[in-house]
């Protein structure tokens, strides 16, 4: 029988390095066997390049395309093949689809003012336009209760969020994880950083009464309980309301 | 030493045709595009085709398209123009430049860095 | 097509003093942030063609620094300061932008 797409290519930059394409067949297909995908650079002199597709499922194809650091007015031409038939032909433009890079090395420390640091790479380097076009979103959930979650948008300069132990749930075991967009490229979010998890020991302070500061916050000033940690908290019903399309 | 050596040039009467070579040197041709530049007696400079480092996309000036076939032999390190149904307007000194690198997914462009010496093309009854 | 104009088309300097060539396209050559694509030749007499400058600005191997380009998007300039005798020739524009490749008319530099 005839190969159909059933959904055409969809593409994403990470705008340095790299651009996925996916789309789905209507029938389960052999990506790698059976298809392939060309895309050349809408520049004179530039080449024809192939990309092998895998299976992301039975019939949903992926293909990573190395493309060279993305700037503004790079189109590419796409081509999708099986054998000699073309089956979807169509142009992808990195900049206006931007997925950003997965922010790395999620760590949490304990700091001043009975306070957990939470702090994460920012995955492009300096002289990468997205580098300082980055805000995040934080996501710290309770391991034990789904109801105890809280989201954090962290939109001002610098890769950390200083969440107060108050807060959490005390000897409760928590987990965050940390994504990116990029506003001024209209980007979509990027994939979740890997979950690193903590025990919050945390008492209301009116318990403490004289009682010495359990560890990890021995020693900590006690004042502060109370500051808010230069990010702005949402809701999750309104943040779910909101982006729950990306 | 990176050298570009062209050949083939000869008097040729309107209508017939002629086939051009540029033997490259001192550099990996096949990663290169390369093109052929023309000037006409007492003239400027007018480009005349681009071949990419594969020979996978070719461009042509106007007013030899469908006359001139652009093409190269990687083994070789030589690039070819074959010149058919010439005409009295295509005298001139053919030079064969080097062009872009093409090996990256943008062509990194440094300007037609190096050129031949010339052949001298003469269309004439 | 992208029109390359240049002026003057003939220039008389003496030798130490400084020439200027300007070059404007019809569309802009800038691709992005400082790519300009386009550069200067000088053709000297009964010689080929030889490069100068590439990307508007970039003086390509074994040009001396005398030489400078300048400018972006439609609006370029060469400057040959402390001109010599050997500078002259026939000096041309070219965009390397898009095909099909055009050049400038050329500008004659004369040393008095």
């Known amino acids: 029988g005839s190969v159909k797409v059933l959904h055409e290519p969809s593409c994403f930059s990470d705008y340095i390095s790299t651009s996925v394409c996916q789309w789905k067949m209507d029938h389960p297909t052999n990506c790698s066997a059976e298809l392939r995908l060309s895309y050349q650079l809408d520049f004179m002199g530039s080449e024809n390049h192939t990309c092998v597709p895998e299976n992301r499922e039975d019939s949903v194809c992926v293909c990573s395309m190395p493309i060279d650091d993305a700037v503004e007015a790079d189109v590419y031409q796409l081509d999708l093949w099986a054998g000699q038939q073309l089956l979807w032909s169509g142009s992808f433009q990195p900049s206006k689809h931007v997925k950003p890079r997965t922010p790395g090395n999620l760590t949490v420390h304990p700091n001043i003012s009975h306070t957990w640091l939470l702090m994460w790479t920012n995955p492009y380097p300096t002289e990468n336009h997205l580098h300082s076009e980055l805000t995040y979103m934080v996501n710290v959930s309770n391991d034990n209760d789904p109801e105890d979650f809280k989201v954090y948008n962290v939109t001002y300069m610098g890769p950390t969020l200083r969440l107060a132990a108050s807060t959490l749930k005390s000897g409760a075991s928590y987990s965050a994880r940390v994504r990116a967009w990029a506003q001024t490229y209209n980007s979509t979010w990027s994939d979740w950083s890997p979950s690193t998890t903590w025990l919050n020991y945390y008492e209301p302070w009116e318990q403490h009464l004289g009682k010495p500061i359990p560890n990890p916050l021995l020693g900590l000033d006690s004042t502060g309980l109370n500051d808010i940690f230069e990010a702005q908290k949402i809701e999750w019903h309104e943040h779910h309301h909101h982006h729950h399309h990306h | 030493e990176v050298q570009l050596v062209e050949s083939g040039g000869d008097l040729v009467k309107p209508g017939g045709s002629l086939r051009l070579s540029c033997v490259a040197s001192?550099?990996?041709?096949?990663?290169?595009?390369m093109t052929w530049v023309r000037q006409a007696p007492g003239k400027g400079l007018q480009w005349v085709s681009l071949?990419?480092?594969?020979?996978?996309?070719?461009y042509y000036a106007d007013a030899v398209k469908g006359r001139f076939t652009i093409s190269r032999d990687n083994a070789k390190n030589t690039l070819y123009l074959q010149m058919n149904s010439l005409r009295a307007e295509d005298t001139a000194v053919y030079y064969c430049?080097?062009?872009?690198?093409?090996?990256?997914?943008?062509?990194?462009?440094?300007?037609?860095?190096?050129w031949g010496q010339g052949t001298l093309v003469t269309v004439s009854s | 097509d992208i029109v390359m104009t240049q002026t003057p088309l003939s220039l008389s300097v003496s030798p130490g003093e400084t020439a200027s060539i300007s070059c404007r396209s019809s569309?802009?050559?800038?691709?992005?942030?400082?790519?300009?694509?386009l550069d200067w030749y000088l053709q000297k007499p009964g010689q080929s063609p030889q490069g100068l400058i590439y990307?508007?600005?970039k003086r390509m191997s074994g040009v001396p620094d005398r030489f400078s380009g300048s400018g972006s998007g439609t609006d370029f300039t060469l400057r040959i300061s402390r001109v010599e005798a050997n500078d002259t020739g026939v000096y041309y524009c070219?965009?390397?932008?898009?095909?099909?490749?055009?050049f400038g008319q050329g500008t004659k530099l004369e040393i008095k």
């Open positions: 071949i990419s480092g594969s020979g996978g996309k070719t």
């Open positions: 569309q802009s050559l800038l691709y992005s942030i400082g790519y300009n694509y």
């Open positions: 001192g550099f990996t041709f096949r990663d290169y595009a």
């Open positions: 430049a080097v062009d872009r690198l093409t090996k990256t997914i943008r062509p990194q462009y440094y300007g037609l860095w190096v």
């Open positions: 070219m965009q390397g932008l898009q095909s099909p490749l055009t």
């Open positions: 990307l508007g600005s």
